[in-house]
Amino acid sequence: KLLQVSTIAMQQQEKLIQQERALLNFTEWKRSCALQMKYCQAFMQNSLSSAHNSSPCPNNWIQNRESCYYVSEIWSIWHTSQENCLKEGSTLLQIESKEEMDFITGSLRKIKGSYDYWVGLSQDGHSGRWLWQDGSSPSPGLLPAERSQSANQVCGYVKSNSLLSSNCSTWKYFICEKYALRSSV
């Protein structure tokens, strides 16, 4: 009799283990589905906002000529700002001309007013040269107005209609830039 009870108990325990395993598999499958769903939504959002509307820029981005710009609503240090832009398939803003600078500062005035916004400009610690993130040099009229008195790495930011410099570890808004989609029509 005792042996019989023991056998039943073991069988029940085995059944319980199998059910736990099944539940674990189901939970994993559910998590996987949720992740896939998240990717699909992000992908669809990206595709639809630009392709479906045949808009050259995603929603909440501003267009000027061949570029799309995103003005952040969060603060971060310069390096994190760069990574945030990369997540969006963009890089920190690279200002190529006075016309582009005027467009950016004009847009910022309309959107947010006089705040600090990181751009993709940093100062080489050894040579002291200012370089954009792709390695190119800024045109003479687009060099930061003041040299930051910082022992740390120095990065460029836009405020009002000026390009200034600051310790890269300070928190600021940032501006991302990506190429606008060309119309296939």
Partner: nanobody, 115 residues
Framework: QVQLQESGGGLVQAGGSLRLSCAAS????????MGWYRQAPGKQRELVAA???????TYADSVKGRFTISRDNAKNTVYLQMDSLKPEDTAVYYC?????????WGQGTQVTVSS
């Protein structure tokens, strides 16, 4: 999920060159940019170079003019051409995929530059 596999690391003399490759597979449609990071012993992982799907590039100050990042969309592969290597470039180099929802990392490849 996205899988990233690095290759091309090794031992090279100062002044020499190496080309790292990172092959991506899986749900790669979710990736918007690809980058290379490095981590030297006792130091933080730092961004070396990155390239967006649109082809925009970004480089760390310390590698500008020496390293070049590129991509082959047909092969789903990103490359890091490293020239004029210095002993301070010695580190484990990691490939990273940037997406809106997640970040994906490769296992890393060791690069050692001897003087």
């Amino acid at each position: 999920q996205v899988q990233l596999q690095e290759s091309g690391g090794g031992l090279v003399q100062a002044g020499g060159s190496l080309r790292l490759s990172c092959a991506a597979s899986g749900s790669i449609f979710s990736i918007n940019s690809m980058g290379w990071y490095r981590q030297a012993p006792g130091k933080q992982r730092e961004l070396v170079a990155a390239i967006t799907n649109g082809g925009r590039t970004t480089y760390a100050d310390s590698v500008k003019g020496r390293f070049t990042i590129s991509r082959d969309n047909a092969k789903n592969t990103v490359y890091l051409q490293m020239d004029s290597l210095k002993p301070e470039d010695t580190a484990v180099y990691y490939c990273k995929g940037f997406s809106l929802t997640d970040d994906y990392w490769g296992q890393g490849t060791q690069v050692t530059v001897s003087s």
